[in-house]
Interface confidence: low
Amino acid sequence: EVKPCDFPEIQHGGLYYKSLRRLYFPAAAGQSYSYYCDQNFVTPSGSYWDYIHCTQDGWSPTVPCLRTCSKSDIEIENGFISESSSIYILNKEIQYKCKPGYATADGNSSGSITCLQNGWSAQPICIKFCDMPVFENSRAKSNGMRFKLHDTLDYECYDGYEISYGNTTGSIVCGEDGWSHFPTCYNSSEKCGPPPPISNGDTTSFLLKVYVPQSRVEYQCQSYYELQGSNYVTCSNGEWSEPPRCIHPCIITEENMNKNNIQLKGKSDIKYYAKTGDTIEFMCKLGYNANTSVLSFQAVCREGIVEYPRCE
């Protein structure tokens, strides 16, 4: 009878019944024995004990106890491990991802570490980075493509372009939230001065000496005045777009009504404001009669002007 299996020397574990050594070994094919694995080691099936089987080719499994690595031994900043298992066996590769704006040492958004005989192959690394930004009318003073946290990138404007107030060079800093700002140089002739003033209106913001292209400024009209057009102006090619107009209201005064022997119908106001397009109704004062049709007692406000009807 062939006896192919000598007493198994189980690294990082052992048989449960060591006293069997003299009686049963070498073992015949088909025999099975229970064994255990030491701490930080598991059987190929992932448990802490199993059976080792004697086959024609020797003991199976050939490596009864496999090293395990614990998820709790992984320290990862600015990234995460998406798998939720807590224990990983020898040669198991685990993926990790970096948060937006972070990358592995070789510049990828994800990486992997492997469970080895002495533990994890490495600790995951997620480094803050900023990509080379898109430059407009300017060039970077660096050949790098990725920049680490707090790195400064200097840039200069092309001839005929500037950043502001005559400056042609600038720098941006890689921060936690990306680049401090985008490097943009403007054609000197494309910038705008303060937006134009408008009658009976004003801007809603503090005015600057110079505005970069695509800046917007908002206007508002004084009380009772009506804004006609867009309430925003935009800087483009060195000029502001057409500003709005503030249309006069019609001011119906007691003085003008007395001159025409009329009064407001249904109102006792001494002074009444009407917007452009509004219809105002009048009636004759007591003791006076209209010398025109009744319809003429409805006047329409047109940009601050109203034609008063008259009573005699």
Epitope: F80, S82, S84, K99, D177, G178
Partner: antibody, heavy 122, light 106 residues
Framework: QVQLQESGPGLVKPSGTLSLTCAVS?????????WSWVRQPPGKGLEWIGE???????NYNPSLKSRVTISVDKSKNQFSLKLRSVTAADTAVYYC???????????????WGQGTMVTVSS | EIVMTQSPATLSVSPGERATLSCRAS??????LAWYQQKPGQAPRLLIY???TRATGIPVRFSGSGSGTQFTLTISSLQSEDFAVYYC????????FGQGTKLEIK
């Protein structure tokens, strides 16, 4: 102290698009947090809709992904939710929330808006 | 999708007594679990994160425990303001909430 405030129409017609905005005050939307939308149908539990990072990166609830768009407007310090092809089942209180940010991949919501009720009905 | 199951659906406890709420995950979520309290007409309020860490300003009577798939929220001595609905939420894989446990006065 960061505060969140939802706004948007309270009534949306079936098959229409639900649009909500969450205004962030007392802090910058460009901080290293994710910003989420969570909803709660009347008398029911909470359902996470999705989240956005200030860079524009998004995560969506897989069950809603085909109908949801979340966007960020850093200039307005706000983020928005659009939910398309709504039905009565989308009637809920919609909350915006901020995750508290630790070293983990995601985190618990430490700040919530007060919520806005949206009814889907013709 | 990880399913979070809370039990019981309703829990009746007298003020001053201890309340124990359970939450089970359909697969391991490690310690990536939070507990929230919600009162009628209000937004949820974060109580516990990381399974056992109290959020800022949360009284010590609230404590969380567990990891993997089984979690517990314990309120050691119930106050009148503690009667509300409690939700667990996992954030290990996307984000999902439990269906809630209503804590009512006995």
């Amino acid at each position: 102290q960061v505060q969140l405030q939802e706004s948007g129409p309270g009534l949306v017609k079936p098959s229409g698009t639900l649009s909500l905005t969450c205004a962030v005050s007392g802090g910058s939307i460009s901080s290293s947090n994710w910003w989420s939308w969570v909803r709660q149908p009347p008398g029911k539990g909470l359902e996470w809709i999705g989240e956005i990072y200030h860079s524009g990166s998004t995560n969506y609830n897989p069950s809603l992904k085909s109908r949801v768009t979340i966007s960020v407007d850093k200039s307005k310090n706000q983020f928005s939710l659009k939910l398309r092809s709504v039905t009565a089942a989308d009637t809920a209180v919609y909350y915006c929330a901020r995750d508290q940010l630790s070293s983990g991949p995601t985190d618990a919501f430490d700040i919530w808006g007060q919520g806005t009720m949206v009814t889907v009905s013709s | 999708e990880i399913v979070m199951t809370q039990s019981p659906a309703t829990l009746s406890v007298s003020p001053g007594e201890r309340a124990t709420l359970s939450c089970r995950a359909s697969q391991s979520v490690s310690s990536n679990l939070a507990w929230y309290q919600q009162k009628p007409g209000q937004a949820p309020r974060l109580l516990i994160y990381g399974a056992s860490t109290r959020a800022t300003g949360i009284p010590v009577r609230f404590s969380g425990s567990g990891s993997g798939t089984q979690f517990t929220l314990t309120i050691s001595s119930l106050q009148s303001e503690d009667f509300a609905v409690y939700y667990c939420q996992q954030y290990d894989n996307w984000r999902t909430f439990g269906q809630g446990t209503k804590l009512e006065i006995k």
